[in-house]
């Protein structure tokens, strides 16, 4: 059932990386507009993106209030010129999203190698601790602040002159690895949340190599 010339949204999909979270849906509107509501399982509905012709809605501000909660959203469809109009059941046409738990489901963004420093036969590789939009006490938390020891990084490294890779892991944002003196190495990192069953790994960081500007060398 529904309102004349109004179709329900479909293919509601959560797109979330490092807690930046957008709900997307179809179809592109023809003579209709949308409003989104979001709620936790036990909470009240909050309306967002009022009467929009977009097919996405940024819900980051809502989900960062408690990233461990499970959220449900719904998208209402209204005739473009008559937003008070309701469906035959006396309420606007709407479609529910899948449930979404940010802590368990947000994709891990591509990490960045912040720096590497060589001291003799050791290299310290530091991964940038990316800021998220999750707040605590009016400050934005980093990815490490949010996930703590649940987040690990895997380092891939190899001599510039050979293809054989090595790997190391850390539950901080720093690696201390052994290298051969006089050899240049390249590095790439990947974020992992071992406790997850989906969205466990990020894409690899851009490769950084010794001899480039990010590095520092000391005897």
């Amino acid at each position: 059932s529904g309102t004349t010339n109004t179709v329900a949204a479909y293919n509601l999909t959560w797109k979330s990386t490092n807690f930046k979270t957008i709900l997307e849906w179809e179809p592109k509107p023809v003579n209709q507009v949308y409003t989104v509501q979001i709620s936790t399982k036990s909470g009240d509905w909050k309306s967002k993106c009022f009467y929009t012709t977009d097919t996405e809605c940024d819900l980051t501000d809502e989900i960062v209030k408690d990233v461990k909660q499970t959220y449900l959203a719904r998208v209402f469809s209204y005739p473009a010129g008559n937003v008070e109009s309701t469906g035959s059941a006396g309420e606007p046409l709407y479609e529910n999203s899948p449930e979404f738990t940010p802590y368990l489901e947000t994709n891990l963004g591509q990490p960045t190698i912040q720096s590497f420093e060589q001291v003799g036969t050791k290299v310290n590789v530091t991964v940038e601790d990316e800021r998220t939009l999750v707040r605590r006490n009016n400050t934005f938390l980093s990815l490490r602040d949010v996930f703590g020891k649940d987040l690990i990084y895997t380092l891939y490294y190899w001599k510039s002159s050979s293809s054989g890779k090595k790997t190391a892991k850390t539950n901080t944002n720093e690696f201390l690895i052994d290298v051969d003196k006089g050899e240049n190495y390249c590095f790439s990192v990947q974020a992992v949340i071992p406790s997850r069953t989906v969205n466990r790994k990020s894409t690899d960081s851009p490769v950084e190599c010794m001899g480039q500007e990010k590095g520092e060398f000391r005897e």
């Epitope: 690990i152 892991k169 466990r200 790994k201």
Partner: antibody
Amino acid sequence: QVQLVESGGGVVQPGRSLRLSCKASGFNIKDYYMHWVRQAPGKGLEWIGLIDPENGNTIYDPKFQGRFTISADNSKNTLFLQMDSLRPEDTAVYYCARDNSYYFDYWGQGTPVTVSS
Amino acid sequence: DIQMTQSPSSLSASVGDRVTITCKASQDIRKYLNWYQQKPWKAPKTLIYYATSLADGVPSRFSGSGSGTDYTFTISSLQPEDIATYYCLQHGESPYTFGQGTKLEIT
């Protein structure tokens, strides 16, 4: 449920090649690191190497680098171990294992390889 | 490469005994140390991960301790079903390396 099933083992002559398979079910291999481990008769466990099936990154114990090759077919959810120039000392049971980054949480039943003339 | 020295290579104990196995790494492995149990003709099974954490479904008589280079695995009260070979594994950096194994028998 999660399962790993190895196949492809058998008797092979020294110098020849063999390709082992590890078919995964109950999860997507691209979400995990996947490993090969072997155990010679009456001996301990020996790590061969790993692959990240999502990006194809492979890491080997240097003693296997160049002679053994780990690969994955994500569409078939299957891991492979290509073993070339086989030697009698490669005789072992070969296991694949899933790595949740804390530990190897699932192992296959193992497939035996015998290198003998 | 990191070497893992596991001891003893074999040990015999009675049901109810406290059993201890040690693994020493050639360098700091930052607790990336797991303990595996392997019974004859079976694949290994994880008992302890990250040096001290008990894997899912593993009885509480198994425990692990240690940090840096020195790690210990303990069975607080040996049971008949604990007859197996036990291995440590460091996975902090490649190549991952297993200890030589400890074969546990009941007297």
